[in-house]
């Protein structure tokens, strides 16, 4: 049902859903801080633009009585319950920030007349693609898929002279929310990734993964998995690995690879890590000081969600346009705004674009080094290290199928 929005007469409110079930096990206080810091910045920016308006956030907390798992498994109805709470209290803001779980976002989008914009830090799954009033500020699965297909097809780089068309995907069901949906997208038989590959098998057991590492009859040399180095070590340990195996470790929201004095453990030598380029100043900013390397991106997405709202509010107010219209709700896409740590670009469907970075372990320095970057906005790969000190033969990535000659 239509809920009146607290969104006029110079007073603009943001509804922030503080859900017990969240894409990351982050304490709410870090998200509260992010939202409040964002508000301070937005107020300053509006003031500087000569707009004398009030911007506030209302935090809507789940009662946690039913949806108490703390992760995304029981989130489907939690978002709807919070929307009902908002509806009953007649306290809807101009924009809704949260939820982060794919299940809850999908359900909320499905079951509500969304005449207001919805900004999510998460909602990684393909089921949240192409939603007209949904903006996602953390890389969704679709962006990962496009990188992988692009990289698989690449065959004209000094370190990658073969196109690949095969892959194993390790997915054991214990993944974090982001990994769950990333791997889900790779597994889906109708997805772009599956469509472009000739062979793809999902490994669901630890033993299956471990056996492939030295199996002479394997159908692919490439294994995609998702998680941090520790996750890989638990699985792989110090087992021997065939020399032409390439493990692609998807670990997008983890800045630790870029921190000073980080040395790559020996078990990472056969691994290419796919992560996001860290913000210019985020590693040392006051905002991120209390956040672990894997959680900065989540809190930052909340902060940037506030800044995005401020950006759109400023544009609409300067143009004398109404905020409570479908035009406003549909405007949170195909734009670049000033985020906390530099420009943030949203694509035509409101999904954040970013620079993905593929890292390798230098056999000389035992450091993580950038092999290439990928701009999700233009779907283009840019080589960085033209002569990497790989563990692989001739410092080139092997073919994806053992014994197959040049393509």
């Amino acid at each position: 049902s239509q809920v009146s929005q607290n969104c006029h007469n110079g007073s603009y409110e943001i509804s922030v859903l503080m859900m017990g079930n969240s894409a990351f096990a982050e304490p709410l206080k870090n998200l509260e801080d992010a939202v409040n810091e964002g508000l301070e910045i937005v107020r300053g920016r509006l003031q500087n633009a000569g707009l004398n308006v009030t911007v506030n956030a209302t935090f809507m907390y789940s009662d946690g009585l039913i949806h108490n798992s703390g992760d995304c498994r029981s989130s489907t109805c939690e978002g709807l319950d919070l929307l009902r709470k908002i509806s009953n209290a007649q306290r809807m803001g101009c924009v809704l920030i949260g939820p982060s779980c794919t299940y809850s976002t999908f359900q909320m989008y499905l079951d509500t007349e969304l005449s207001y914009p919805m900004i999510s830090a998460g909602s990684f799954g393909l089921s949240c693609d192409y939603k007209e009033t949904l903006t996602r500020l953390m890389s969704p699965a679709r962006k990962l898929m496009y990188f992988l297909v692009n990289f698989w097809k690449t065959n004209d780089l000094p370190f990658k002279t073969y196109s690949w068309s095969t892959s194993y995907v390790y997915k054991n069901g214990t993944e974090t929310e982001d990994c769950f949906w990333y791997l889900n997208a790779l597994e889906a038989s109708v997805s772009y990734f599956s469509h472009e590959l000739g062979f793809k098998v999902v490994l669901r057991q630890d033993k299956e993964f471990q056996d492939i590492l030295m199996d002479h009859n394997r159908k692919s040399n490439v294994i995609i998995m998702c998680g941090g180095p520790e996750f890989l070590y638990k699985l792989k340990g110090d087992r021997a690995v065939a020399e032409d195996i390439v493990i692609i470790l998807v670990d997008l929201f983890n800045d630790q690879y870029f921190e000073d004095n980080v040395t790559a453990p020996d078990y990472m030598k056969n691994v290419l890590v796919l992560t996001l380029s860290p913000g210019n100043s985020l590693l040392n900013s006051s905002f991120s000081r209390n956040l672990s390397p894997t959680k900065r991106d989540f809190a930052l997405a909340y902060l940037n969600g506030i800044l995005l709202f401020g950006h759109m509010l400023k544009i609409f107010l300067e143009n004398g346009e109404n905020i409570t219209t479908p035009k406003f709700a549909h405007a949170f896409r195909n734009l670049t705004f000033e985020g906390y740590d530099g420009p943030v670009t949203l694509d035509d469907w409101g999904d954040v674009d970013s620079t993905m970075v593929l890292l390798y372990t230098s056999v000389d320095t035992k450091k993580y080094k950038v092999l290439l970057t990928y701009d999700t906005h233009v779907n283009k790969t840019y080589p960085v290290d033209m002569s990497p000190t790989f563990t692989w033969k001739n410092s080139k990535l092997p073919n994806d199928i053992t014994g197959r000659g040049p393509q």
Epitope: M18, G20, L28, E32, D33, E37, G64, F287, R289, N290
Partner: antibody, heavy 116, light 110 residues
């Protein structure tokens, strides 16, 4: 270290100003809290100021408390208005560890007595 | 509100015995829970954070467990020096709070 000051005897309706002076660490990298303990009772959280000056208050304290900080003087201040006898307590200043896990450093406390 | 309920309010234990203190959160706080020990006339001393990690210099006789809404502090091989009041505290949210600390459990050592 952390040390509270400003306690003593106050009258009902007075305004209380407590100061927490810190040394050995920077206020810009820690959240700082005020906690109180009424005689023979438990701990009661009052307010927090984050490393970037965002403030939060317990619901009961919100309308009459203000927490501020001065990074150049290394002080955190709690101002509480409209005092009543129920505000008689030992007031502690406590630092939250850098990851936000727990209050790792507490002051010895300062006793505040409200009596007419 | 994220309310913390501690039980029992008071417990007697013999030297060498084991004591168990429970803390319940009104909503899931994952493992964002800390335990403190406070002796009369002193400020609280941190014992455990993230539900189960021992704070620096704390004896391994203290053990924390639990996640979500149910947490436990166990003191084994109780010594006279353990006589104190113990408090749990959620460190999950700063907003929407009445307190954040549990009501406390007094441990009396016989």
């Amino acid at each position: 270290s952390v040390k509270e000051s400003g306690g003593g005897l106050f009258k009902p309706t007075d305004t209380l100003t407590l100061t927490c002076t810190v040394s050995g660490f920077s206020l810009s990298s820690h959240r700082m809290n005020w906690v109180r303990q009424t005689p023979g009772k438990g701990l009661e959280w009052i307010a927090i100021i984050t490393h970037n000056s965002i403030t939060y208050y317990a619901s009961w304290a919100k309308s009459r408390s203000t927490i501020t900080r001065n990074t150049s003087e290394n002080t955190v201040t709690l101002k509480m208005t409209s005092l009543t006898a129920a505000d008689t307590a030992t007031y502690f200043c406590a630092r939250e560890d850098s990851m936000g896990y727990y209050f790792d450093l507490w002051g010895p406390g300062t006793l505040v007595t409200i009596s007419s | 509100a994220y309310d913390m309920t501690q039980t029992p309010a008071s417990v007697e234990v013999a030297v060498g015995g084991t004591v168990t203190i429970k803390c319940q959160a009104s909503q899931s706080i994952s493992n964002w829970l800390a335990w403190y020990q406070q002796k009369p006339g002193q400020s609280p001393k941190p014992l455990i954070y993230r539900a189960s990690t021992l704070a620096s210099g704390v004896s391994s006789r203290f053990r924390g467990s639990g996640s979500g809404t149910q947490f436990t502090l166990t003191i084994s091989g109780v010594e006279c020096a353990d006589a104190a009041t113990y408090y749990c505290q959620q460190t999950y949210t700063n907003n929407h709070l009445d307190n954040g600390f549990g009501g406390g459990t007094e441990v009396v050592v016989k």
